[in-house]
């Protein structure tokens, strides 16, 4: 189906700012420095193509990408299909975040990305340092006390952690829009599952201790489990699609070159190992450092603490997919009753994990709802 790519999209070689301005939208690019020294690129689309004249404060919407991804996820389709552009055109002040370790967040004040120390993080640190630093920056820059948070995949995970453990940060979130939410991964059918067969003592032997490059680890599972489903030498070598799954029917195949050139955007081996721990335990908890002594050093307890989403009082709207391999409907089913302020839920039976960011019908299925919910919030 996608045997050959004709390099038709100029965004293939562009950075985030170039992608935004290519479509005629205004762009502001900032660097946010976290408490532990990571330098994260943050982009702003302050208004849309047709509403620059509207004065007054626009509601702020912050978009946070998922696992192995980056801010380009929100701008990889044509403007009428990309959530960031749709929100900007609807009159909102749109901000795009990046998590440490991805293409646009691979610098640190103290460590080089060539060092092991740079890569000693998982989604715990993204929640503890990246989100507060970025949200604080946006609040200061816009002068607005609250913002709307849209997370996809791991972007929801770090939201659950940050907003349940950091009450002052939670106060800054007007509404949390969770697309393909991931807390537990007890029932995941993603190939991330296969990583659980790698013993802890061998994980770094196989994958190293810096950036996560799966090399050919997944090859032994692909032929039977993924690639025989009518696809496709191209997607079968891409870690994002391997781990998240894909849906040929819902993809705009002419944009595939953009998706593949910007993904996977990179994360740490430690982060992938944390996800592996979560698959094994079936629990939503902090990184297990491997021994009671080391856990005590980090957490003052011998076991990593559990994350308690019931402590998150932020109003939350949830969209999940019935065919999602990573955010399995059973795991979402465990999550929903624990959310004390669930204001909306929709399961899209035929959606998989990446459909929420790239599906051709995402505006009809998801984005239009978000736009109208934010506008209701304004009143």
């Amino acid at each position: 189906l996608f045997g050959k790519l004709h390099p038709g999209s100029p965004e293939v070689t562009m950075n985030i700012s170039q992608m935004i301005t290519y479509w005629g939208y205004p762009n502001e690019e900032y660097e946010v420095v976290t408490e532990d020294g990571y330098i994260l690129e943050v982009n702003r689309i302050p208004y849309g193509k047709k509403n620059s004249g509207n004065t007054g404060q626009r509601p702020v919407v912050f978009l946070q990408h998922g696992l192995l991804a980056s801010a380009t996820n929100w701008i990889s389709n044509l403007p009428n299909n990309s959530l960031a552009f749709i929100l900007a055109d609807a009159g909102y002040d749109v901000w795009l975040g990046n998590s440490r370790g991805n293409t646009w967040a691979r610098r640190n004040l103290y460590y080089s990305p060539d060092s092991v120390e740079f890569w000693a993080f998982s989604f715990d640190e993204m929640a503890k340092y990246d989100l507060p630093a970025t949200i604080d920056f946006i609040v200061k820059k816009t002068g607005q006390k609250q913002l709307h948070y849209v997370g996809h995949s791991q972007g929801t995970t770090i939201g659950f952690i940050a907003f349940s453990t950091n009450p002052s940060l939670a106060k800054r979130i007007k509404t949390f829009y969770a697309l393909a939410p991931v807390a537990t991964v007890k029932y995941t059918k993603s190939l991330i599952n296969k990583l659980r067969f790698v013993p802890q003592s061998l994980f770094k032997f196989i994958f190293g201790d810096k950036i996560f490059y799966p090399h050919n680890f997944f090859d032994q599972f692909l032929a039977t489990e993924v690639c025989s489903r009518e696809m496709l030498n191209l997607l079968c070598s891409n870690a994002l699609f391997i781990i998240c799954g894909f849906d040929s029917k819902n993809f705009n195949t002419s944009r595939l070159d953009v998706y593949l050139s910007h993904n996977p955007a990179g994360t740490s081996v430690q982060n992938m190992f944390h996800w592996t721990q979560a698959v094994k335990s079936g629990k939503f908890q902090a990184y297990d450092w491997g021994s009671p002594v080391q856990n005590r050093m980090h957490y003052d307890q011998s076991q990593p603490p559990y994350y308690n989403v019931t402590a998150m009082n932020v109003p939350i709207a949830v969209w999940n997919g019935g065919k999602d391999l990573l955010a399995d409907p059973q795991d979402v089913g465990l999550l929903l009753p624990k959310l004390p302020n669930l204001i909306y839920h929709k399961e899209i039976p035929f959606y998989n994990h990446l459909d929420f960011i790239w599906a051709m019908d995402a505006p009809q299925e998801v984005y239009n709802d978000i736009v109208s919910m934010i506008s209701e919030d304004k009143k």
Epitope: S115, V116, S201, L202, K204, F205, D209
Partner: nanobody, 120 residues
Framework: QVQLQESGGDLVQAGGSLRLACAAS????????MGWYRQVPGKQRELVAA???????YYVNSVKGRFTISRENAKNTVYLQMNSLKPEDTAVYYC??????????????WGQGTQVTVSS
């Protein structure tokens, strides 16, 4: 200077067996993990089997039930017992050891490789 030296590679008939050995010298630490990779000309080097210093093992699907990895921690030596060999097992087999004095100084150390040829 840490060095890894493989031995045991040979030409063998399909269905036959071989035992590869890899010995480390010059190391002031014991490896956290050791293992075997293989490479066919024109293809990427691929993991075959690995063993941690806690004894935990990992095998790729294609060799499960046929190959067994073991190690002698005291000697920093790792073995690969290969049974029921198939022509597709033909490759250069490389030994890898991973270790360091601290978690931030861990490195991968590689041997020079030993040729295994399985004829049909």
């Amino acid at each position: 200077q840490v060095q890894l030296q493989e031995s045991g590679g040979d030409l063998v008939q399909a269905g036959g067996s071989l035992r590869l050995a890899c010995a480390a010298s010059g190391s002031t630490f014991s490896f956290n993990a050791m293992g075997w990779y293989r490479q066919v000309p024109g293809k990427q080097r691929e993991l075959v089997a690995a063993i941690g210093n806690d004894g935990s093992t990992y095998y790729v699907n294609s060799v499960k039930g046929r190959f067994t990895i073991s190690r002698e921690n005291a000697k920093n030596t790792v073995y690969l017992q290969m049974n029921s060999l198939k022509p597709e097992d033909t490759a250069v087999y490389y030994c890898k050891g991973r270790g360091g004095l601290t978690q931030y100084s861990e490195h991968d150390y590689w041997g020079q490789g030993t040729q295994v040829t399985v004829s049909s």
